[in-house]
Interface confidence: low
């Protein structure tokens, strides 16, 4: 079975203390839930009214956890340095900020004179309702989990390209005389809580995780 990604691209570090604190609050709620008589957790799918029962043991396996997936009672806070950018790859409608936290600065911190080949933007996505699993099947993502009367939302830390062409010729700093280049979003698979029929189940789903530069050699013109 594939492992979920644990490394976040440099320059897009997930606020670890914040993540750990929220995971700790989830663990506390789970301990309370386990000691409760029914030990049952009601999970609600966004847009659905019926309750789904989730076994608390679903959360016991720590190897399933990825720093890119977070269960939180409140929207995760980004670092203080944020940009108010309404940008989404593919020209779709701007992000709805009632569901998504502001994204981090499009530029990671560099030393003076250092630049990024591609600009990326990162955001905690909290309104994911469907996703593509590792086999290419569209699956329903659990939006919220109700544990011991605390509603935990499932957030995904996603990183994508801000622009396929940071400069006219493509990626920044590439010798455009010899190379064609463009920036593209790459993906990874993380374990997320999804609906499997009438119950919750962990599945690997695909999320945007980095922005890389794609190069191809320009055709050599012979005299």
């Amino acid at each position: 079975e594939p492992h979920s990604e644990s490394n976040v691209p440099a320059g897009h570090t997930i606020p670890q203390a914040h993540w750990t604190k929220l995971q700790h609050s989830l663990d506390t709620a789970l301990r309370r839930a386990r000691s409760a008589p029914a030990a049952a957790i009601a999970a609600r799918v966004a847009g659905q009214t019926r309750n789904i029962t989730v076994d608390p043991r679903l959360f016991k396996k720590r190897r399933l956890r990825s720093p890119r997936v977070l269960f939180s009672t409140q929207p995760p806070r980004e670092a203080a340095d944020t940009q108010d950018l309404d940008f989404e790859v593919g020209g779709a409608a701007p992000f709805n900020r009632t569901h998504r936290s502001k994204r981090s600065s499009s530029h990671p911190i560099f030393h003076r004179g250092e630049f990024s080949v591609c600009d990326s933007v990162s955001v905690w996505v909290g309104d994911k309702t469907t996703a593509t699993d590792i086999k290419g099947k569209e699956v329903m993502v659990l939006g919220e989990v109700n544990i011991n009367n605390s509603v935990f939302k499932q957030y995904f830390f996603e990183t994508k390209c801000r622009d396929p062409n940071p400069v006219d010729s493509g990626c920044r700093g590439i010798d455009s005389k010899h190379w064609n280049s463009y920036c593209t979003t790459t993906h990874t698979f993380v374990k997320a809580l999804t609906m499997d029929g009438k119950q919750a189940a962990w599945r690997f789903i695909r999320i945007d995780t980095a922005c890389v530069c794609v190069l191809s050699r320009k055709a050599v013109r012979r005299a």
Partner: antibody, heavy 125, light 112 residues
Framework: EVQLVQSGAEVKKPGATVKISCKVS????????ISWVQQAPGKGLEWMGA????????RYSPSFQGRVTITADKSTDTAYMELSSLRSEDTAVYYC??????????????????WGQGTLVTVSS | DVVMTQSPLSLPVTLGQPASISCRSS???????????LSWFQQRPGQSPRLLIY???NRYSGVPDRFSGSGSGTDFTLKISRVEAEDVGVYYC?????????FGQGTKVEIK
């Protein structure tokens, strides 16, 4: 090498049921969808439905809904397509095809990168 | 259902000459992720179909580079730069953006 080997030709009477098998090898059976496609004599391709062998999640075309049942046996790496209430217009070659979402950017079912050799079903009274 | 319309339905070609097949869909085949799910298949006489092109313009492994795909949205084209004898057969476009999956009627390529 990826291979999809289908069962042999069948001759059926109208109203009967046919069940065709598709045994796969050369890849992990539970990883990819298996689709079934009908091709009537001298006609084009028509998608009937597909199954995810890992959990037997099946999707059907409305044109065949109610008459077709697609199943998968993980223990033998074999997919099956059963078509009931046969009529003369069901005379066709039936193909199974492996749908590799890797080739389609993780589309729901589409890819069809490997096909079985086809099974001719003749419906005649 | 998404209707896929191919033209021409019959295409007589001269060996070594280019050939072009058009495919039009009744709905956009672009999905939310930005990908366009349009494939091209070749079916030689007496054989099973074979994947040539996936996602509009990506050649499947082992497919000769004389085959190329292009287009966007609802209009797509398969081009054969120089037709060879082994290219004779029926070519189908197919869409994977919407269920049920649907194919064009097919274009029969034959040598003049």
């Amino acid at each position: 090498e990826v291979q999809l080997v289908q069962s042999g030709a069948e001759v059926k009477k109208p109203g009967a049921t046919v069940k065709i098998s598709c045994k796969v090898s050369g890849y992990s059976f539970i990883t990819y969808w298996i689709s079934w496609v009908q091709q009537a004599p001298g006609k084009g391709l028509e998608w009937m439905g597909a199954i995810d062998p890992s959990d037997s999640d099946a999707r059907y075309s409305p044109s065949f809904q109610g008459r077709v049942t697609i199943t998968a046996d993980k223990s033998t790496d074999t997919a099956y397509m059963e078509l009931s209430s046969l009529r003369s217009e069901d005379t066709a070659v039936y193909y199974c095809a492996k749908s590799d979402p890797g080739y389609s950017g993780y589309s729901l079912l589409y890819g069809f990168d490997s096909w079985g050799q086809g099974t001719l079903v003749t419906v005649s009274s | 259902d998404v209707v896929m319309t191919q033209s021409p339905l019959s295409l007589p070609v001269t060996l070594g000459q280019p050939a072009s097949i058009s495919c039009r869909s009744s709905q956009s085949l672009v999905q939310r992720n930005g990908n366009t799910y349009l494939s091209w298949f070749q079916q030689r006489p007496g054989q099973s179909p074979r994947l040539l092109i996936y996602q509009v313009s990506n050649r499947y492994s082992g497919v000769p580079d004389r085959f190329s795909g292009s287009g966007s949205g609802t209009d797509f084209t398969l081009k054969i730069s120089r037709v060879e004898a082994e290219d004779v057969g029926v070519y189908y476009c197919g869409q994977g953006a919407h269920l049920p999956l649907t194919f064009g009627q097919g274009t029969k390529v034959e040598i003049k």
